[in-house]
Interface confidence: medium
Amino acid sequence: LQDLCSNCPAGTFCDNNRSQICSPCPPNSFSSAGGQRTCDICRQCKGVFKTRKECSSTSNAECDCISGYHCLGAECSMCEQDCKQGQELTKKGCKDCCFGTFNDQKRGICRPWTNCSLDGKSVLVNGTKERDVVCGPSPADLSPGASSATPPAPAREPGHSPQ
């Protein structure tokens, strides 16, 4: 004689005003846990959203974003417009990264280039709107007499081919 509602399984709801105590969730609704008093309305993936997983009686639909947009928030609650690499999304749309900043993704904001000199290093490859700078060894590391991180290769005797 245990509480009937607590035994209504996922996919049903407790509706003891009808001929059945546990009634199946109506179309376009679900209950993911047992003992529910109501079924939840299925999420609809419309507009910029597209369906990744259909709703079932026991689980909600899951949405993705259509091409040209990407998901934001928990369970893809929002879709945000993609930009090109080297751009960021502003209120006025996609704008190129300002000089000294970059964005290597289709989402997010432009970030400043790494300041190599803060680590005592030099710029090996210049940054672009799409790529960060590549830092190389410090100028001191390249000066004559500086200890090398890797030992010099042994000299080969003439006439011997490499092993």
């Epitope: 245990q2 509480d3 009937l4 035994n7 003891n16 105590i21 546990c22 047992g34």
Partner: antibody, heavy 113, light 111 residues
């Protein structure tokens, strides 16, 4: 927490009687699943009816009890069972139960002329 | 109305032994709504098992419920004198009328 039934009596066939189940140590203001079960002398258990307290849900009845027996919540600590047109076959100990795990000691109803 | 048929009474076993009580429902119980109750003379029933196999609070693990659909079993192992009682199965059904039904009970004797 405990339950106690009251109202059991010796009545004549055709009479009506109301049994009361009183809760101690808890109240029916929150949702509880309350049932009445009876047991004729030397016989087995027989389910009568159940109701959700604190809820407008339809009570559940055994088909033989529907129309002659009425279960209802009458206060935050009492559930009643109204019985009409009693016959000798209704002679039994009547138990109330909460969620199937808490039971009262029972009250005896005897129908005899 | 639903009918629950239990093992005929009495069932006898010695202290330390094992008894098995079967319960067959005339129709499938809903979502494993099956309970087992123990009753001693002059006392109300005591729930041992609910949802077919879940042990009620404070009940020794010597009591074990199993089964699904229409066939259920209560097994009592390491039998004690105190286990002498009548055991009832109760089934729950997904209908507002005749929601529950009890079996007729099985008396267990401990020798």
């Amino acid at each position: 927490q405990s339950l106690e039934e009251s109202g059991g009596d010796l009545v004549k066939p055709g009479a009506s009687l109301t049994l009361t189940c009183t809760a101690s140590g808890f109240s029916f203001s929150s949702r509880h699943y309350m049932c009445w079960v009876r047991q004729a002398p030397g016989e087995g258990l027989e389910w009568i009816a159940c109701i959700y307290t604190g809820s407008s849900g339809t009570p559940h009845y055994a088909s033989w009890a529907k129309g002659r027996f009425t279960i209802s919540q009458t206060s935050s600590t009492t559930v009643t069972l109204q019985m009409t047109s009693l016959t000798a076959a209704d002679t039994a100990t009547y138990f109330c139960s909460s969620e199937g795990n808490l039971w009262g000691p029972g009250t005896l109803v005897t129908v005899s002329s | 109305a639903q009918v629950l048929t239990q093992t005929a009474s009495p069932v006898s076993a010695a202290v330390g032994g094992t008894v098995t009580i079967n319960c067959q429902s005339s129709q499938s119980v809903y979502s494993n709504w099956l309970s087992w109750y123990q009753q001693k003379p002059g006392q109300p029933p005591k729930r041992l098992i609910y949802s077919a196999s879940t042990l009620a609070s404070g009940v020794p693990s010597r009591f074990k419920g199993s089964g699904s659909g229409t066939q259920f079993t209560l097994t009592i192992s390491d039998l004690e004198c105190d286990d002498a009682a009548t055991y009832y199965c109760a089934g729950g059904y997904n209908t507002v009328t005749d929601t529950f039904a009890f079996g007729r009970g099985t008396e267990v004797e401990v020798k």
